[in-house]
């Protein structure tokens, strides 16, 4: 069967360029997802951000993220969702485990799980940011 | 050993549509991205779109949008291209190509498969 | 888009001269950057991915560099075999856009 090569070696910085992008994605979906009136955030629902166990960029839960947000694109037609997911893929090894999402059926539950997984998805992508500008910081101190 | 095998050479008429297929063996990862590139004689590499075959998921040029639809059959291994309305500028090699890794997004494209040459003639 | 602007589209050189190709970037592609050859009658084949690593396989004289949203594919001895056409193309975000390809001949 056929074997990975070596895992490439980035520099931090453009890894870092990634989660800004992503960062900057995630809020053009926030906002898009906002505009829609009277819906509440849910506390049923949990999007995987940050793995303790792991350093930076390894770190964030990007398979259960993008499968999350394949889920959105699928409850609801937001383009920014493709850009996101094909950044989501640089940070996603080829052996990385498929993550299974329940999707809601109801109509309003629906439109809970969108906004509150894109507000955990931008909160998500600051904390990243934030895990990989430390983690930097402390390399180089 | 990876290997990408396209089907054989096609003649169409202006109008019709064409299923361009890429089987590809020795690989076992679903989470990659396989894109599809042709070239007109003498010119150089167009891409035409892309494909993630553990989901079907597509990206398409905007030039093609709309004409070409590609698919992907994780069973056999096998993605298809199908392009339609054809017209004289679209003879040309149709390529399929996908990259080793070690991420699911490409960084370049590493196994290329021998090309399908499609002639649009009336 | 992101358009591809690659440089020269055609050039002469003799062999064991130094040969440089560029691509420039619509905007910045983070070293997404992918450089191949392709031979007359022949399948593209990927020389450079990532900018600057070398594929499998790929003769040392080969390298690549980036300085901004330009980046270069350089041959640092032109040898008679290395007669072809070569691309750059990009991977930030789709579309993956194709330069426009260089075609390099021997004097």
């Known amino acids: 069967s056929h074997t990975l090569p070596v895992r490439l070696l980035r520099p931090s910085d453009d890894v870092q360029k990634i989660v800004e992008e992503l960062q900057s994605l995630s809020k053009m979906l926030l906002k898009d997802v906002e505009e829609e009136k009277g819906v509440l955030v849910s506390q049923n629902y949990t999007l995987p951000c940050l793995s303790p166990d792991a350093q930076p960029p390894n770190n964030i839960h990007s398979p259960a993220i993008r499968a999350y947000l394949k889920t959105i694109r699928q409850l609801d037609n937001k383009s920014v969702i493709d850009e996101i997911i094909e950044h989501l893929d640089k940070l996603i090894f080829q052996d990385a485990p498929e993550t299974n999402i329940s999707v809601p059926t109801d109509t309003h539950e629906c439109k809970r799980f969108i906004l509150t997984i894109s507000q955990q998805f931008s909160e998500c992508m600051d904390l990243a940011l934030k895990s990989l500008t430390s983690g930097a910081q402390q390399a180089t101190t | 050993q990876v290997q990408l095998v396209q089907s054989g050479a096609e003649v169409k008429k202006p109008g019709s549509s064409v299923k361009v297929s890429c089987k590809a063996s020795g690989y076992t990862r679903t989470r990659y991205w396989m894109q599809w590139v042709r070239q007109a004689p003498g010119q150089g590499l167009e891409w035409m779109g892309a494909?993630?075959?553990?989901?079907?998921?597509?990206r398409y040029s905007q030039k093609f949008k709309g004409r070409v639809t590609i698919t992907a059959d994780k069973s056999t291994s096998t993605a298809y291209m199908e392009l339609s309305s054809l017209r004289s500028e679209d003879t040309a090699v149709y390529y399929c190509a996908f990259p080793e890794g070690p991420y699911a997004a490409p960084y370049g494209m590493h196994y290329w498969g021998q090309g399908t040459t499609v002639t649009v003639s009336s | 888009a992101i358009q591809m602007t690659q440089s020269p589209s055609s050039l002469s050189a003799s062999v064991g001269d130094r040969v440089t190709i560029t691509c420039r970037a619509s905007?910045?592609?983070?070293?997404?950057l992918a450089w191949y050859q392709q031979k007359p009658g022949k399948v593209p084949k990927l020389l450079i991915y990532y900018a600057k690593t070398s594929a499998s396989g790929v003769p040392s004289r080969f390298s690549g560099s980036r300085s901004g949203t330009d980046y270069t594919l350089t041959i640092s001895s032109l040898q008679p075999e290395d007669v072809a056409t070569y691309y750059c193309q990009h991977f930030w975000k789709t579309p993956w856009t194709f330069g426009g390809g260089t075609k390099v001949e021997i004097k």
């Open positions: 494909i993630y075959p553990g989901e079907g998921d597509t």
């Open positions: 905007r910045n592609i983070h070293n997404y």
